[in-house]
């Protein structure tokens, strides 16, 4: 259940996250699974552990194998496995299937291609982008933060896109490349001002003190793929991440597409062990896209 495949190219940086994630304060120990030998944490080593991350700076083919991470969480030490494969650089332009990240689809309205795994690295903009090994040039291509945007997408924009960036570790630079396929969907999509399906505005939900409850924020933004569509919860006007109450957690937004083609997003707010003070909070469901922001408020009340 907590095993993950990771791959990279020799002489490039590879950073792998422990599939068994814990809180940032938890100590994580890394081992070579075959030998049970501990991986050092000193940064002078080519391969070293840094909390939840295992760093190969740079990677070698011989690094391939299974690595064990043990998260020293309270009560249990929880184990994860990272299956790492390092490949030799390809002499030609062809990127084999085993080096490809997940395929993304785009349309005329939405043509974002994210650079895979980039969030694990210490990189600075701009990214370099290549299509079928050719550097992308021209005003149609915009490298924006960690993704590429293509204006006026056409069917012949489909292909393999490679992002290239530099990872910096203590002043040393390491190259990283990642490739994924892009397919073009011919769909007549549109975007409109967000419509919140749930909760109803100024709704009140009955809860029992001491029990768990979920609040779902569900909004639709138009038809087809959307360029920007976010759904999130706020507590008393503050982001969940700024509200330091570990009992209240927001799940990542889940995309939904209905039979009528509507593009909708659901985000669930999980409240564990409901307390009296939770009844005093204002829970705002926020839906945002390029057209604007819509907000619905819900409050909790004690079940009679």
């Amino acid at each position: 259940k907590f095993s993950k495949q990771s791959w990279g190219l020799e002489n490039e940086a590879l950073i792998v996250r422990c599939p068994r994630q814990g809180k940032s304060s938890y100590i994580v120990d890394w081992y070579y699974s075959q030998t049970n030998k501990s991986i050092p944490t000193q940064e002078r080593n080519r391969v070293f552990a840094s909390g939840q991350l295992l760093k190969f700076l740079p990677a070698e083919v011989a690094d391939s194998g299974i690595y064990t991470c043990i998260v020293r969480s309270p009560t249990f030490n929880r184990t994860g496995y990272a299956n790492v494969t390092i490949y030799k650089k390809q002499p030609d332009c062809n990127v084999p299937d085993y080096l490809m990240y997940s395929t993304v689809s785009g349309s005329e309205k939405n043509s974002k291609i994210y650079c895979p795994t980039i969030d694990l690295y210490n990189w600075t903009a701009p990214l370099e982008w290549f299509k079928n090994c050719q550097a992308l040039q021209g005003s149609r291509y915009k490298a924006h933060k960690s993704f590429l945007v293509i204006d006026n997408v056409m069917t012949d924009d489909a292909g393999d896109y490679t992002c290239k960036f530099i990872h910096n570790e203590n002043g040393a630079n390491y190259s990283v490349t990642a490739t994924r396929s892009f397919t073009v969907k011919d769909e007549q999509g549109f975007s409109r001002f967000p419509v919140i399906r749930a909760p109803a505005h100024n709704e009140t939900k009955e809860v029992e003190i001491g029990e768990n409850t979920n609040l779902t924020c569900s909004a639709c933004f138009g038809k087809g793929a959307q360029f920007l569509a976010t759904v999130q919860w706020q507590l008393n006007g503050n982001k969940i991440t700024d509200f330091s109450e570990p009992r209240i957690q927001q799940e990542e937004g889940q995309n939904q597409s209905f039979s009528n083609g509507l593009a909708c997003v659901n985000t669930v707010l999980r409240i564990a062990d409901v307390k009296e003070e939770d009844l005093l909070l204002r829970y705002d469901c926020l839906a945002l896209n390029l057209h604007g922001l819509r907000r619905h408020t819900i409050r909790l009340s004690r079940k009679n």
Partner: antibody
Framework: EVQLVESGGGLVQPGGSLRLSCAAS????????MHWIRQAPGKNLEWVSA???????YYPGSVKGRFTISREDAKNSLYLQMNSLRAGDTAVYYC????????????????WGQGTTVTVSS | DIVMTQSPLSLPVTPGEPASISCRSS???????????LDWYLQKPGQSPQLLIY???NRASGVPDRFTGSGSGTDFTLKISRVEAEDVGVYYC????????FGGGTKVEIK
């Protein structure tokens, strides 16, 4: 209502086997670490086994190799398979909810079942 | 394994008076996340145990505020500000830092 209900206890001969079940309701069972805790007659509480949301299992030396904990999230159920039972295993066995293994939140062993009695005797 | 030692073994109390139970662990119960993984439980006669205090000092839902948990490192205390008749039973401390270990219990009874 958050609830745990144990079943499967009974009288068994030394060397015999027994399977305890625990039915959970009122909470998202699949995200929680679950425990079996026992109490011998007139004695204090003793932790017997645990299983986390990944299905990884944990045992003390006294039962390792004899007891097997398992979970069936689709049925909101926890099990304890007890083999090679000894007189010293005689106790009330409690099913109990541990921390939220998904968010790594811990609020104590906050839900306990009513217990099921296991008697090992010839 | 972490060993938990409770005292006293038995505690006769007078209703309305305060009571205090001590618990000591064989090693610090402080985790790298900054919390002490020490809980207190009450087992009333003929009932399952019930959670009173978690993470050293946090009162569980529905627990009266006359119960207070305190302490750090290896030494912890449960205080009852004014004992009531319904508070009788066996009190257990439990560490949850490394698996679970219970203390030997303290039997609280009315004088």
């Amino acid at each position: 209502e958050v609830q745990l209900v144990e079943s499967g206890g009974g009288l068994v001969q030394p060397g015999g086997s027994l399977r305890l079940s625990c039915a959970a309701s009122g909470f998202t069972f699949s995200t929680y670490d679950m425990h079996w805790i026992r109490q011998a007659p007139g004695k204090n509480l003793e932790w017997v086994s645990a299983i986390d949301l990944a299905g990884d299992t944990y045992y003390p030396g006294s039962v390792k190799g004899r007891f097997t904990i398992s979970r069936e999230d689709a049925k909101n159920s926890l099990y304890l398979q007890m083999n090679s039972l000894r007189a010293g295993d005689t106790a009330v066995y409690y099913c109990a909810r541990g921390g939220d293994g998904y968010n790594y939140d811990y609020y104590g062993i906050d839900v306990w079942g009513q217990g099921t009695t296991v008697t090992v005797s010839s | 394994d972490i060993v938990m030692t409770q005292s006293p073994l038995s505690l006769p109390v007078t209703p309305g008076e305060p009571a205090s139970i001590s618990c000591r662990s064989s090693q610090s119960l402080l985790h790298s996340d900054g919390y002490h993984y020490l809980d207190w439980y009450l087992q009333k006669p003929g009932q399952s145990p019930q959670l009173l205090i978690y993470l050293g000092s946090n009162r569980a839902s529905g627990v009266p505020d006359r119960f207070t948990g305190s302490g750090s490192g290896t030494d912890f205390t449960l205080k009852i500000s004014r004992v009531e008749a319904e508070d009788v039973g066996v009190y257990y401390c439990m560490q949850a830092l490394q698996i679970l270990t219970f203390g030997g219990g303290t039997k609280v009874e009315i004088k």
